[in-house]
């Protein structure tokens, strides 16, 4: 017998390790909290929905409870969806949550609240208000929380939840929290640092604030702070894609010398975008620990050719200098000061938006001998010259990025060319950097309301390709022409971006010739020209290939195409080809013995397979080894009879979704003997095979989601005993068989879905209806989306809480 | 700009405490800046006393923490300096300046006062 | 207490002389040096903070350097105004100074 009931319209999961039961209802359209949540459950997701009020009985019976998420049930019309705007705060009547001994962490951001709730238990040690209408901190609202360690007060005022009155806190409000580690006060208008904060912080987050001044004395008491963020106060606002006032005059954040001098655990300092124009060594005085540095957005060009205060940070691993150019200037090239060669521990350094014209070898020598050293990101800097054999010192790094600059084999050092293209160059960059988000986001710690933890995304290299080692990113470059003396001495080289130039070569084999280790390349969004089969063939040690988006010679007539250029790679494993518009091919096959993956999406098969012309139906034949095939989005409205046959023998996975096809013959399913995941979604089908099972004996996953089938046969389902997941969501069913579905295939399915179809619950429906109510099998949505269009009385109603006892009394009958 | 004038008597008997004032004008000593004491003994070197931060906060140099107290009138933008049990060895000239604790180092005294002799004699 | 020593404690020099005063300190002051300059009846001014930062209005023609124990004040054309009295001082711990380096006219 199941321990809760079909009913409750939210996914329930048991974390065997923790001793966690895990209800989660996240954005299930709730108005109220529903019944059946069992009883010994430990984690209660209600964000994303409209439940308007909270009481003593909301969590009655729910003793366990160790964790409540209850954000986003009334989000601040600024922050909120326009079409379902929330016009009355949640209400939280007294005690609600005093009876639940065992709570530890209580969510209740983005709910328009106006105070601290009271009544919290003593047991609680996280409490998340953020995004809420509290904008007066009071020492006798926090007196309930002796216990708590994790405090989250931030976004309750700011541009997109404006609050119109300065945030106030009282002095020593914070004083009596005597276990808090973690404070949050971000994007929240505070005008000076709250004192006297307690002892026990470890991480105090101030940042998108309007604190213009530290005080010597801010922090003279947190001597066990591990991280501190005082980014976005005095922001840089040159660019700023949010609404952004700079201190007076431009000013910076005024920190004084000595303001730093407790904090000997720190591990973690954020002075993003605080207008800083010197950075004084003596802040670094007694942080010795120190193992992250962000200094990106402020104005520190100069203090880069000088840095003493480098001297300071023997521990230091993160540090990021990105966007300190100097306004309407164009560099010649880059100045680090020599103290960077004293960053010994250093692993990662970030130097984006220097913003200068060449890239010369004598410039990073202060970093030859930082043996840490893993990733130089020296992006989006207008970079036009680099001759880059100079990073044959730095074979040990994982990453060099040298994206998004201006790099072209045509560079000539003679030319300085400083004014000319000073000015055009800083402006011609500001919607690429939007594009980013990252260094320009206002708050890219920010949490949305589907997910609770803090979402730092950090835009990095593509990670599939970092993963096979030291990477070389060019992507987003000027690049129109490539050599193979542009690579000499980086035969170190396991990957290898050029995505987003200008390439519109004859590749030959000889270009890539150095890179005898490479193992990655992306050479999508460039113009290949593939005249010749030996393309690429140097990369003896490529695995993957991705020339995807390189659709400017395949859409022109007349040109020839060697698509059988696959057969020279001879360890090639992935080959990505998506979005080309192939319609053509000078040769009839691809070959391979390696290829093990091939994505051929947003292509012309279309053509290529056009009835009457059998040329190209062996296409894929010979890639001997090829397991998966993704031929999605080929405008494929029917496939010609020769298309199975003329497959990979040992094709495993076959993706055929979003192609427009009207019909399938599933029986030619019978060639691919070893197929294990059939994808036909996104289609305009109408049948399913009268019997999978004769069709193909391998299939264990089977997705037709987002296609017109209104029934399925009588046998559908009939010993197809090795099916493990069926997708039937977002058809037209309107009536399941038992025939159909019978219980010996059923019992072995791991998910079906089954949601977003037009179900009609008359009295024909009642197997299926008790079906739904007493299978193990997991069907997702079931409380929620799997639901009747009719008739009238049950429409919209969701078919497992059906009562059809009337058509059960007519059967007995 | 900022201007700061040591005042106080000139003469001081031995084991009495010596107490001189430093008037501060266009600036207000809570805004900013820690406000010095240093004395020069004669033909010696200038010595640091201590100082009274903008926020009311003292240090003293080790060697003469036991003698000396360092206050501020903030109604009249003065700070002060009691140095007890003096000896002829507090003959000396005294002092007044100022550190910016926003600029870029320590003790980096960007603002003296003249000078005011003080004699310890009886 | 970390100690300052200054050397030379005088020296003569004509107007258009390139003038250098050293300073050593007992122990590494990690550059936190700085060098004033006093005349008779004048409040002190701050010349170089920092080993080689230029205090505001002070003339390019002074100059600093040095690391670690050793440091240096260079005036690279003697002017007649510059003849005073400067001394250096640490400001790592405590502040310390120098016995003064008297610049008198030859």
């Known amino acids: 017998a199941r321990w809760f009931p079909k009913t409750l319209p939210c996914d329930v999961t048991l974390d065997v390790p923790k001793n966690h039961v895990i209800v989660d209802c996240t954005d299930k359209h709730l108005t109220e909290i529903p019944g059946g949540i069992p009883t010994n459950t430990t984690n209660l997701t209600l964000t994303i929905n409209h439940i308007p009020d909270i009481s003593p009985a909301s969590f009655h019976r729910l003793d366990h409870l160790v964790e409540i998420d209850f954000r986003c049930n009334c989000v601040p019309i600024p922050l909120g969806s326009k079409n379902n705007m929330c016009i009355k705060r949640l209400q939280i009547k007294p005690r609600s949550f005093s009876g639940l001994t065992y709570l530890k962490s209580l969510y209740l951001d983005g709910n328009q609240l106006l105070e601290i709730p009271q009544g919290l238990p003593p047991s609680l040690q996280l409490l998340s208000l953020e995004a809420n209408n509290i904008f007066s901190i009071r020492k006798e609202n926090l007196t309930e929380l002796a216990n708590i360690e994790i405090l989250y007060l931030g976004q309750n005022c700011y541009y997109r939840n404006p609050c119109y009155v300065s945030y106030s806190i009282e002095k020593d409000a914070f004083l009596n929290l005597t276990k808090l580690k973690v404070l949050s006060l971000k994007d929240n208008n505070v005008t000076a640092v709250p004192t006297v904060l307690p002892s026990t912080l470890t991480e105090l987050y101030l940042y998108n604030n309007m604190i213009a001044k530290i005080q010597e004395d801010d922090f003279n008491n947190l001597n066990q702070l591990q991280i501190l963020d005082l980014s976005g106060n005095c922001p840089r606002c040159y660019n700023a894609p949010f609404p952004c006032a700079p201190c007076k005059n431009n000013s910076p954040l005024q920190i004084p010398v000595n303001a730093f001098d407790a904090l000997t655990e720190l591990k973690v300092l954020r002075l993003h975008s605080n207008s800083l124009q010197h950075v004084p060594p003596r802040w670094f005085k007694n942080i010795n620990k120190l193992q992250e540095l962000d200094l990106s957005q402020n104005f520190l060009a100069k203090e880069i050719g000088d840095a003493k205060f480098l001297h300071f940070l023997p521990s230091l691993i993160q540090l990021d200098l990105s966007f300190n150019f100097e306004l309407q200037v164009y560099r010649a090239s880059m100045n680090l000061s020599q103290a960077f060669s004293s960053l010994k521990s250093l692993k990662i350094l970030r130097i984006r938006g220097y913003v200068f014209k060449e890239l010369k070898s004598f410039n990073l020598s202060p970093l030859h001998n930082l043996q840490n050293l893993e990733v130089l990101d020296l992006g989006t800097n207008f970079i036009k010259i680099a001759n880059l054999s100079m990073f044959k010192q730095f074979k040990r790094l994982k990453v060099i990025d040298l994206s998004v600059n201006k790099i072209s084999p045509s560079g000539d050092s003679s030319e300085v060319g400083f004014c000319s293209n000073a000015r055009t160059s800083v402006e011609s960059y500001e919607p690429q950097v939007l594009e980013q988000l990252h260094y320009f986001r206002y708050d890219k710690y920010a949490r949305s309301c589907r997910f609770k933890n803090k979402e730092a995304s950090f835009m990095s290299v593509n990670e599939s390709c970092y993963k096979y080692g030291q990477t070389l990113d060019l992507s987003k470059n000027s690049i129109f022409f490539v050599k193979s003396s542009d690579f000499q001495h980086l035969s170190f080289l396991k990957c290898l971006n050029l995505s987003g130039n200008l390439i519109s070569q004859t590749l030959n084999g000889s270009e890539f010739q150095p890179l005898a280790e490479l193992r990655y390349l992306d050479f999508s969004n460039n113009r290949l020209d593939l005249l010749h089969s030996t393309a690429f063939e140097e990369l003896h040690k490529l695995e993957v290939l991705d020339i995807s988006s390189n659709s400017h010679y395949f859409q022109s007539e007349g040109i020839t195409h060697m698509l059988n250029f696959t057969k020279n790679l001879k360890v090639l494993q992935k080959l990505m080809m998506n979005d080309n518009d192939i319609s053509s091919s000078t040769s009839r096959t691809m070959e391979s013995e390696s290829l093990r993956t091939l994505e051929f999406r947003g292509n012309h098969l279309d053509v290529l397979w056009r009835e009457g012309d059998n040329r190209y139906l062996q296409l894929f034949k010979n890639l001997l080894k090829l397991e998966e095939l993704d031929i999605s989005k080929n405008s494929l409205s029917f496939l010609p009879s020769g298309v199975f046959d003329g497959m990979p023998p040992n094709l495993k996975n076959l993706s055929l979704a979003k192609n427009g096809l009207k019909s399938f013959s599933w029986k030619k399913l019978q060639c691919l003997k070893n197929l294990e995941t059939l994808d036909l979604s996104h289609n305009q089908l109408t049948t399913v095979p009268e019997r999978l099972s004769n069709c193909s004996r391998s299939l264990k996953n089977l997705i037709l989601k987002n296609n017109q089938i209104r029934s399925l046969t009588k046998y559908f389902l009939q010993d197809a005993f090795q099916l493990r997941y069926l997708d039937l969501s977002s058809n037209k069913i309107q009536m399941i068989q038992k025939t159909s579905f019978p219980e010996n295939v059923l019992n072995n399915l791991k998910m079906l879905l089954l949601h977003h179809n037009r179900f009609l619950c008359t009295c024909d429906a009642v197997w299926f209806v008790w079906w739904v109510n007493h299978t193990e099998v997991t069907i997702p949505y079931l409380a929620t989306d799997v639901t009747c269009v009719g008739p009238g009385a049950h429409k919209g109603q969701s078919v497992i809480s059906l009562d059809l006892y009337t058509c059960e009394l007519d059967l007995t009958n | 700009d900022v201007q700061l004038q040591e005042s106080g008597p000139g003469l001081v008997k031995p084991s009495d405490t010596l107490s001189l004032t430093c008037t501060v004008t266009?600036?207000?000593?809570?805004?900013?800046?820690?406000w010095n004491w240093i004395r020069q003994p004669p033909g010696n070197k200038l010595e640091w006393i201590g100082h009274?931060?903008?926020?009311?906060?003292?240090n003293y140099n080790p060697s003469l923490k036991s003698r000396v107290t360092i206050s501020r009138d903030t109604s009249k933008n003065q700070f002060s300096l009691k140095l007890s049990s003096v000896t002829a060895a507090d003959t000396a000239v005294y002092y007044c300046?100022?550190?910016?604790?926003?600029?870029?180092?320590?003790?980096?005294?960007?603002?003296w006062g003249q000078g005011t002799t003080v004699t310890v004699s009886s | 207490d970390i100690q300052m020593t200054q050397s030379p404690s005088s020296l003569s020099a004509s107007v258009g002389d390139r003038v250098t005063i050293t300073c050593r300190a007992s122990?590494?002051?990690?550059?936190?040096l700085n060098w004033y300059q006093q005349k008779p009846g004048k409040a002190v001014k701050l010349l170089i903070y920092?080993?080689?930062r230029l205090h505001s209005g002070v003339p390019s023609r002074f100059s600093g350097s040095g690391s670690g124990t050793d440091y240096t004040l260079t005036i690279s054309s003697l002017q007649p105004e510059d003849f005073a009295t400067y001394f250096c001082?640490?400001?790592?711990?405590?502040?310390?100074f120098g016995q003064g380096t008297k610049v008198e006219i030859k």
């Open positions: 300046a100022s550190w910016n604790y926003y600029g870029y180092v320590d003790y980096a005294m960007d603002y």
């Open positions: 266009g600036y207000s000593i809570t805004s900013d800046y820690a």
């Open positions: 009274i931060s903008y926020r009311g906060n003292t």
């Open positions: 122990q590494d002051i990690s550059n936190y």
């Open positions: 920092y080993t080689s």
């Open positions: 001082q640490q400001g790592d711990t405590f502040p310390t």
